[in-house]
């Protein structure tokens, strides 16, 4: 019996009767063996086929075979009913070896042929299985040559059989206070072969309850307790199970925080599985209840464990916890069934009493002390001497707990000393030097340094003064005594005040003229304005109507008098106004140098002579009177003149202040 | 976490101001509660001196209000105390705290003398 | 002013004793009371707000009971650093005011 080729050799060939493509010979036995690589198969077809018919071919034939299997048993030219030809058939073996019999009997009635055949190896396609047939691979078959082999969808892996797929179903653990687990695939049979568990892990204090859903199928056997696969559920108190068959399992209250859910299959079947919805429980916390002018949110039928509420109070209500505010409130449900934090009150917003005011006071219009939401109180300044900055004054306690202005200022008002108050009535002439009466000059300021200077009160805080007259203390403002509300010098009834900063104006040059010599002094305190202490107004942008030539301003102080000494009582001097040329041609000869009067001085006295200031009324206010608004302002600021004070034909040299106004509010609200 | 730190000169003249700032870290002091300034004389017991509220309003003992002012500056989460004409009385360790006194700074210590 | 007056003053106990220590508040404070314990050189550490509330990582032997007027802090089994002092305080009206204190030292 000649063997066909055998791998690793190359399996092709031809194969055919003896003696063809002559007649065949009786009694002729002839046996092949092909065989092929693991992983082929051999193809077999025929190109000649002229063989003896008989029936069921029992008289001469070829016979295929694949191991034990039977292929086909061939004779004849063409098939009948109940013999076969090969005709165009091309035949497979089962396997990787192909059996080939020819045998011929004693006798044949006439001559035939025989057959030729043609063979070759080719590769088996074990993903191609036929209808009816377990699939090859449970999930993905890759067919390569000589063999093939498996792979696994997501969340799977390649069983050590090489064909199944076994779910990757461990290690899942559900932390929500309810959820859904399923068998793998559900509501599609389950993957066989495999061990799942998943874990429901709560907070302690939560219980587990599992509710088996929709439907439950799992392989069962009809005497045995759940042989195949099965599903169990353990908790640190018992275990359920194992379930399988297809009626739902009951409710399952684990009064555990923590379950571990095994389901195990085998090899076979086809079953749905099942689907448990778990949700867990645990003990309630006392209902809140709702403080007074407060609400719970959210409204919940009960609370349970890391179930939480917040209060929220009324429009003009706060939380409190006693005298402790809170701008929010959250409780937590333990797990022993309390709240974590007790419940806070919503007490009416409460703004307390207002701030004092300085030179104000305050009235209750609500009702006596009412201080709490919406109540309202009215500030007002102390009347003659002070006015109201800004607002109205009326204030009303808000639900932020802040006293609110009706522009939503949270801030005080502010009561501004009303200036350019005298008890004086100008009269329109001109006359000597004369003694000052209390409330004439309440701006008057009386400076003790070095030297005796003079200055005028601005605002309750500040006080101006001539750059000159304060030069020497601008690096020691302390050194300044400062002394208003007298009219004696030398009188020790006066208000105190004293020097916190000096600011020189930065274009004053000290010893080369008296360009710029102006200078302002902060208080370190504020002062009590009164009929004695008032300060003077900076002027308008109209203010220069009023001090054109030959008007009047009136010029004070405790400087030399004729007889040559510092006057003990404040003298005054109205004097006009100087036109600026005249003034300018009076000091160009000399001894005083060119350009000695600039733009930013103004000048006051007679032609004549004999009303002037003079050494020691320094910095001091010259004054005019306002008749618009019925209030003084300083002009000038005593600057300097003539080495002889009052002398004919020379003038009393005085800062003109109105140059200066965006220098003095610039160093007030910087300072 | 939160942390409270004081921070302030540890001597003071008498007649003067005491300035003490307190810094908070790992809360913002206008998020909620109030946030207190507390004060132990050494080896005595505590005394309260007041609040400011995450609002910025404040509440002050009685018996210190007409010396104390407490402020803040919510851009560097810090609030503070001023405590004027000071004498030997005031001399104790100061401690800052949030809300009752859930969270305290390590407290400094001022000593006032000339 | 609402005074808070704590007894004792001071007491001597070992470890393992259970210990309790009250305060009187001289008007209704509610419960708007807290329990600190205070070590020398160190800062008050909050142990029981709202008579009853032990704070976090506040050991479960520290409780704390009472309303209105009359409060209690119970240390149930005395540990080696418990000895300290402790101070009531009531946070219900201004101005918020503490007890003076117990000393609790080793017997």
């Known amino acids: 019996t000649p063997l066909g080729p055998k791998w690793p050799e190359p399996v092709f060939g031809r194969l055919a009767s003896p003696g063809f493509p002559g007649e065949y010979a009786n009694d002729q036995e002839r046996r092949w063996t092909l065989t092929a690589p693991p992983g082929y198969r051999l193809r077999l077809y025929f190109t000649h086929f002229d063989l003896e018919l008989s029936h069921l071919c029992e008289y001469d034939f070829v016979k295929l075979s694949s191991g034990a299997k039977v292929l086909a048993t061939l004779c004849g030219q063409e098939s009948t009913d109940t013999e076969r030809a090969p005709g165009k058939d091309t035949f497979y073996s089962l396997g990787s070896s192909l059996d080939i019999t020819f045998r011929s009997d004693y006798s044949n009635e006439k001559p035939f042929t025989g057959f030729e055949a043609f063979y070759a190896a080719e590769d088996i396609d074990e993903c191609q299985v036929a209808p009816g047939e377990a699939p090859t691979c449970d999930h993905h078959c890759h067919n390569h040559l000589g063999g093939f082999y498996c792979s696994c969808r997501a969340g799977y892996v390649l069983h050590r059989n090489k064909r199944t797929c076994s779910a990757l179903c461990s290690g899942q653990v559900f932390t929500q206070r309810s959820g859904e687990l399923s068998s793998p695939e559900y509501p599609r049979p389950y993957p066989k072969l495999s061990s799942c568990t998943y874990s429901i892990s709560l907070e302690e204090g939560f219980s587990v309850i599992l509710d088996f859903v929709e439907s439950f199928d799992v392989e069962t056997h009809p005497e045995t307790l759940c042989p195949y696969d099965f599903l169990k559920i353990q908790t640190d108190r018992e275990e359920h199970g194992p379930f399988c068959g297809k009626t739902l399992p009951h409710r399952i209250e684990t009064k555990s925080n923590t379950v571990t859910i095994t389901f195990v299959t085998d090899e076979s079947g086809d079953h749905t599985g099942w689907k448990i919805h778990y949700t867990s429980t645990a003990q309630p916390c006392p209902y809140p209840m709702a403080p007074p002018n407060g609400h719970v949110s959210p409204v919940q039928a009960k609370y349970i464990l890391k179930d939480s509420f917040s209060i929220f109070c009324e429009t003009g209500y706060e939380l409190l916890q006693g005298h402790l505010p809170l701008k929010s409130f959250t409780a937590v449900c333990q797990k022993d069934g309390s709240w974590d934090r007790p419940m806070p009150a919503c007490s009416i917003v409460d703004c307390g009493p207002p701030d004092d005011l300085p030179s104000g006071r305050v009235e209750y219009i609500t009702g006596p002390g009412v201080t709490t939401y919406k109540a309202v109180i009215q500030y007002s300044c102390e009347e003659t001497f002070y006015t109201m900055k800004v607002n109205d004054g009326k204030y009303v306690c808000e639900a932020d707990g802040f006293w609110t202005s009706s522009k939503g200022e949270k801030s005080l008002p502010v009561c501004e000393p009303v200036c350019g108050l005298s008890a004086r009535t100008t009269g329109g002439r001109i006359y000597g030097g004369q003694k000052a009466k209390p409330g004439d000059f309440p701006w008057q300021v009386l400076i003790l340094g070095g030297t005796t200077a003079a200055g005028a009160l601005l605002y309750d805080n500040w006080v101006l003064t001539a750059a000159h007259a304060v030069y020497e203390q601008k690096h020691d403002a302390s050194a300044l005594d400062i002394r208003m509300g007298t009219l004696k010098r030398l009188s020790p009834h006066y208000t105190q005040a004293w020097s916190e900063a000096v600011f020189i104006h930065e274009g004053y040059t000290h010893d080369a003229g008296f360009d710029n010599d102006i200078a302002l002094i902060k208080l370190n305190n504020k002062v009590v304005i009164n009929s004695n202490i008032t300060p003077i107004c900076l002027p308008r942008k109209e203010a220069e109507s009023f001090m054109r030539t030959d008007d009047i301003g009136t010029a004070s102080g405790w400087g030399l008098t004729q007889r040559g000494f510092l006057a003990r009582n404040l003298m005054y001097v109205d004097i006009p106004i100087v036109d600026h040329q005249k003034c300018t041609a009076a000091y160009e000869k000399p001894p005083y140098p060119r350009g000695s009067v600039t733009a930013n001085m103004l000048c006051a006295g007679l032609e004549s002579g004999g009303k002037d200031s003079c050494r020691g009324d320094s910095g001091g206010a010259l004054v005019f009177l306002d008749s618009e608004t019925e209030r003084w302002f300083v002009g000038g600021i005593v600057s300097w003149g003539s080495m002889n004070c009052g002398e004919a034909g020379q003038y009393g040299v005085y800062t003109k202040v109105i140059n200066y106004i965006p220098w003095i509010e610039n160093i007030i609200s910087d300072f | 976490q939160l942390q409270l730190q004081e921070s302030g000169p540890g001597l003071v003249k008498p007649s003067e101001t005491l300035s003490l700032t307190c810094t908070v870290s790992?809360?913002?002091?206008?998020?909620?509660?109030?946030w207190n300034w507390i004060r132990q004389p050494p080896g005595k017991g505590l005394e309260w001196i007041g609040y400011?509220?995450?609002?910025?309003?404040?509440s002050y003992n009685p018996s210190l209000k007409s010396r104390v002012t407490i402020s803040r500056d919510t851009s560097k989460n810090q609030f503070s105390l001023k405590l004027s004409s000071v004498t030997a009385a005031d001399t104790a360790v100061y401690y800052c705290?949030?809300?009752?006194?859930?969270?305290w700074g390590q407290g400094t210590l001022v000593t006032v003398s000339s | 002013d609402i005074q808070m007056t704590q007894s004792p003053s001071s007491l001597s106990a070992s470890v393992g004793d259970r210990v309790t220590i009250t305060c009187r508040a001289s008007?209704?404070?509610?419960?708007?009371v807290a329990w600190y314990q205070q070590k020398p050189g160190k800062a008050p550490k909050a142990l029981i707000y709202?008579?009853?509330y032990r704070e976090s990582g506040v050991p479960s032997r520290f409780s704390g009971s009472g309303s209105g007027t009359d409060f209690t802090l119970t240390i149930s089994s005395l540990q080696p650093e418990d000895f300290a002092t402790y101070f009531c305080?009531?946070?219900?009206?201004?101005?918020?005011?503490f007890g003076g204190g117990t000393k609790v030292e080793i017997k």
């Open positions: 305080q009531q946070f219900n009206t201004n101005p918020l005011t």
């Open positions: 008007q209704n404070v509610g419960t708007n």
């Open positions: 400011i509220s995450y609002s910025g309003r404040t």
């Open positions: 790992g809360y913002s002091i206008t998020s909620d509660y109030a």
């Open positions: 709202s008579a009853s």
């Open positions: 705290a949030r809300h009752y006194g859930d969270y």
